[in-house]
């Protein structure tokens, strides 16, 4: 039985050209996290595997950095980065948990700076 829950940063905003940390946290389960996949809509961004460490998709290597922790840092943001991001936690023995984050990249300095995981 899957008892865990994924907490995410929810809906966040950031300024064009800036950086943002995407963060998810799995709680309420003793399941072992074997791998976390990060996806942007229909693109695999990165994978963090308990044994193999991080793999960043080559097409995102210049703008995606691993961490902190199981999170993902997006750099040099563009308006095209606006959209849904998913953290997919592969666990044993529970199975798969998925969290969703919506990022809005704003043209000007109207981005909110109160987001808990945002880089100033």
């Amino acid at each position: 039985m899957m008892t865990g829950t994924i907490e995410t940063t929810g809906n966040i905003s950031a300024e064009k050209g800036g950086s943002i940390i995407l963060q998810c946290h799995l709680s309420s389960t003793t399941a072992q996290v074997t791998q976390v996949n990060w996806e942007q809509q229909d693109q695999l961004l990165a994978i963090c595997n308990a044994d193999l460490g991080w793999h960043i998709s080559p097409s995102f290597k210049d703008r995606v950095a691993p961490g902190p922790g199981l999170g993902l840092t997006l750099q040099s943001l563009t308006v095209n980065d606006t959209g849904e991001y998913f953290c997919i936690y592969h666990t044993y023995p529970d199975g798969t948990y998925t969290g969703r984050i919506f990022l809005e990249v704003l043209e000007s300095s109207v981005a909110e700076h109160g987001a808990r995981f945002q880089i100033p």
């Epitope: 072992q32 791998q35 996806e39 695999l44 595997n49 308990a50 044994d51 193999l52």
Partner: antibody, heavy 118, light 107 residues
Framework: EVQLLESGGGLVQPGGSLRLSCAAS????????MHWVRQAPGKGLEWVAG????????SYADSVKGRFTISRDNSKNTLYLQMNSLRAEDTAVYYC???????????WGQGTLVTVSS | DIQMTQSPSSLSASVGDRVTITCRAS??????LNWYQQKPGKAPKLLIY???SLQSGVPSRFSGSGSGTDFTLTISSLQPEDFATYYC?????????FGGGTKVEIK
Amino acid sequence: EVQLLESGGGLVQPGGSLRLSCAASGFTFSSYSMHWVRQAPGKGLEWVAGIWSSGGTTSYADSVKGRFTISRDNSKNTLYLQMNSLRAEDTAVYYCARVPYGVWMDYWGQGTLVTVSS
Amino acid sequence: DIQMTQSPSSLSASVGDRVTITCRASQSISSYLNWYQQKPGKAPKLLIYAASSLQSGVPSRFSGSGSGTDFTLTISSLQPEDFATYYCQQSYSTPLTFGGGTKVEIK
């Protein structure tokens, strides 16, 4: 250098059993998911079974579920496929493959031929 | 199960030609799509993983694109050693499934 070497294939009668082995070298075997893929003569590729790095999670194609068992011995750097209740349609070359991150098969063995015939 | 449909099943081309092979999934698989090359009597070889990432050591004339349900493998300028059978494979969910293959033959 990464190497995967399958063995254990051969001729077996319908209803019989075989155990295939895949000896791995050149990488940290315990860190990788490993899969078996087969190819019937003149046909395409068919995934058979997979086992994740810890060995706790396994998965099978419907066509072999309940008859085949995938396992691994990380201390011996070896992957296994126990095949029971073999049928003529199981005749194929069986390949083992390394699967980093459970997503792509980056190294394959040379294959071992299993022939099920009376 | 996710079905993978490859087209064409075979094609004839000449050295230097641009060759395109397509693969369609029966449901969205994000970018969990890999391409393999197989020559007669040999094991498959990984060319492209995660839809568009070129495997180390594979010539840059091979490229992959697509996401969701529609994917493409392109060989920009066919070389003599590229005559082979090509397979797509989804790793979005088990059971993992392969396309039926595309045989690239010499015209």
